[in-house]
Amino acid sequence: APVPPGEDSKDVAAPHRQPLTSSERIDKQIRYILDGISALRKETCNKSNMCESSKEALAENNLNLPKMAEKDGCFQSGFNEETCLVKIITGLLEFEVYLEYLQNRFESSEEQARAVQMSTKVLIQFLQKKAKNLDAITTPDPTTNASLLTKLQAQNQWLQDMTTHLILRSFKEFLQSSLRALRQM
């Protein structure tokens, strides 16, 4: 199983090292999740030809996956630390149902899928400690999530493959934009 950040042998062998700051821990956690996504994408791309499909073709889907927009304050123009942090946390909370869907979608990378899901939960906790305005963060409705999950799991095989690919790609892009913004904070 993948080793969570901070628990690899290098860390054990270097007890004299300075403990990670909150920002460094978040940075490391996101890179760890990105590594996990990369492994999952490899399996997905080996299994189907979804990865060759053009972005335009894939855009025609009914998934409401979180995406960074100018108004979210995470890009250089209109950068706003607090607005951006709220968007990152809200987006990660919205991704959780899609990460649940990914469980059981992988044969050789089942543990990796679980690691991505659990590491994201930890990341959300790290970020919530960093946020000042927790009231602005809206948590997805569990009933809505449950029915969405049921609907996604009822799709035919081709659509399930497409959904898996889109979730991984969108989650990767969201994390990349999030980390780029967090590195400015």
Epitope: M68, F75, Q176, L179, R180, R183
Partner: nanobody, 124 residues
Amino acid sequence: QVQLVESGGGLVQAGGSLRLSCTTSGRTFSSYAMAWFRQAPGKDREFVADIGENSDNIWYADSVKGRFTISRDNAKNTILLQMNSLKPEDTAVYYCAADSYGVGGGKPEYYDSWGQGAQVTVSS
């Protein structure tokens, strides 16, 4: 890691323009965040600009904003830095850098591959 090769440096008068180019032969170029840094004699390496893998997330240092433009052509495995209204203080060795996580950022430690650098000299 990817091999990065910069070109397009040279000597130019203040107010002039130059275009730097950075090319790689790496197959996975499109998944990297790419950046330009610069280093003047006796100074630390300084962030200039970076660009995400989809060209939709671009950041500039305040000192170059409005004068420099970073862009990428994934089909040609190339990133460009168009430098206009050059000033003597832009004189430095310009380095191309790549981040395999596709994130980027303003610190050199975020990048795992570096080019050899291209000298840019702006005379007054």
